[in-house]
C-alpha cells in the first residue's frame, strides 16, 4: 500500500507534514511522528530551547539559544 502525501502508517491514517516555520520546526519519521529540529521542543516543535541556564521564570526566547529578560531582570541568564 502506498500512502498519499503526508500520510503514514498502517491504514495510512497518521498525518504528518514536515515544516520549518512559525507553526513548527520538525521532520516526520517513518511512522509519521514529529521529530523536532535541533533547538526546538514541544508537541508541535514550535517552542525554542533557550540558552542553557536561562531562567525559566524571568527569561524566554523566540529563537533557540537566546535568553531575553523580562523587565526588571538582567544578566546572561536573566537571573
Amino acid at each position: 500500500v502506498t500512502c498519499d502525501d503526508y500520510y503514514y502508517g498502517f491504514g495510512c491514517n497518521k498525518f504528518c507534514r514536515p515544516r520549518d516555520d512559525f507553526f513548527g520546526h520538525y521532520a516526520c519519521d517513518q511512522n509519521g511522528n514529529k521529530t523536532c529540529m535541533e533547538g526546538w521542543m514541544g508537541p508541535e516543535c514550535n517552542r525554542a530551547i533557550c540558552r542553557q541556564g536561562c531562567s525559566p521564570k524571568h527569561g524566554s526566547c523566540k529563537l533557540p539559544g537566546d535568553c531575553r529578560c523580562q523587565y526588571g531582570w538582567q544578566g546572561l541568564y536573566c537571573d
Epitope: F23, G42, P43, R68
Partner: antibody, heavy 119, light 107 residues
Framework: QVQLVQSGAELKKPGSSVKVSCKAS????????MHWVRQAPGQGLEWMGA????????AYNQKFKGRVTLTADKSTSTAYMELSSLRSEDTAVYYC????????????WGQGTLVTVSS | DIQMTQSPSSLSASVGDRVTITCRAS??????LAWYQQKPGKAPKLLIY???TLADAVPSRFSGSGSGTDYTLTISSLQPEDFATYYC?????????FGQGTKLEIK
C-alpha cells in the same frame, strides 16, 4: 479538559483601542500557539494572527499588521489581543482559539468577546 | 495568500437529504483543510480536519473528501441539528483563510 475563557463585551469609541483577554486551562500553555479569529455581524470568519506563548513569537495577518498586538502572560496562562485605531468595521465577535493535538486545526475555542465600535 | 471559495452560499434541504458543500482553494493546500459547523451565537465547532478525518465525537454522517485545490463536505442524511452555517478553512500556510460560509436552512 482544555478551556479558553475570554473577557466580557466591550463598547469602544472610534480611534480608541481594545484589549481582549483569553485565559487558558487544562493544558501546558506554552506548548501551543494561541490564535485569534474575528467575525463581524452576519459575516464569515477571519484569522488575525497567532502567538507562541513560550517565547512570544508572533505571526500576523498582513491585513491587521500594525493595528493588532498579541501578547501572552505565562504566569497566568493568559493571552491578549489588542486592536488599535478602532473603526466601525471592527465591530465583531473576537475569538481566541487553539490547535488540537497532532496538528489539528482549531479544535478549541473561547466563547467569544463582542467588541462594538460606535460613537 | 491562498483564497478559499465556498459554494453554495446558502442551501435549503430537508431532514434525510444528502447534502454536499464544496470548497476551492486558489492554490494546492495538500489536504490541509478543515470544516467547521457554527450555530447562531456560538463558536465554530471543528468537524473534519486534514480534508477527510472526522474530529472527536462528530457523527459518521459527516464526511470529507478531495485533494489539491478541490474539497467537499458531505452530510449523508440530514438531521434537525445539522441546520447551521458551515465553513472551510485551509491551514497550509499563514494567513489561514476561511471560506465565506454556507448557510444550510430547512426547506
Amino acid at each position: 479538559q482544555v478551556q479558553l475563557v475570554q473577557s466580557g463585551a466591550e463598547l469602544k469609541k472610534p480611534g480608541s483601542s481594545v484589549k481582549v483577554s483569553c485565559k487558558a486551562s487544562g493544558y501546558t500553555f506554552t506548548d501551543y500557539e494561541m490564535h485569534w479569529v474575528r467575525q463581524a455581524p452576519g459575516q464569515g470568519l477571519e484569522w488575525m494572527g497567532a502567538i507562541q506563548p513560550g517565547g512570544g513569537g508572533t505571526a500576523y495577518n498582513q491585513k491587521f499588521k500594525g493595528r493588532v498586538t498579541l501578547t501572552a502572560d505565562k504566569s497566568t496562562s493568559t493571552a491578549y489581543m489588542e486592536l488599535s485605531s478602532l473603526r466601525s468595521e471592527d465591530t465583531a465577535v473576537y475569538y481566541c482559539t487553539r490547535r488540537g493535538y497532532d496538528d489539528y486545526p482549531f479544535a478549541y475555542w473561547g466563547q467569544g468577546t463582542l467588541v462594538t465600535v460606535s460613537s | 495568500d491562498i483564497q478559499m471559495t465556498q459554494s453554495p452560499s446558502s442551501l435549503s434541504a430537508s431532514v434525510g437529504d444528502r447534502v454536499t458543500i464544496t470548497c476551492r482553494a486558489s492554490g494546492n493546500i495538500h489536504n490541509y483543510l478543515a470544516w467547521y459547523q457554527q450555530k447562531p451565537g456560538k463558536a465554530p465547532k471543528l468537524l473534519i480536519y486534514n480534508a477527510k478525518t472526522l474530529a472527536d465525537a462528530v457523527p459518521s454522517r459527516f464526511s470529507g473528501s478531495g485533494s489539491g485545490t478541490d474539497y467537499t463536505l458531505t452530510i449523508s442524511s440530514l438531521q434537525p441539528e445539522d441546520f447551521a452555517t458551515y465553513y472551510c478553512q485551509h491551514f497550509w500556510s499563514a494567513p489561514w483563510t476561511f471560506g465565506q460560509g454556507t448557510k444550510l436552512e430547512i426547506k
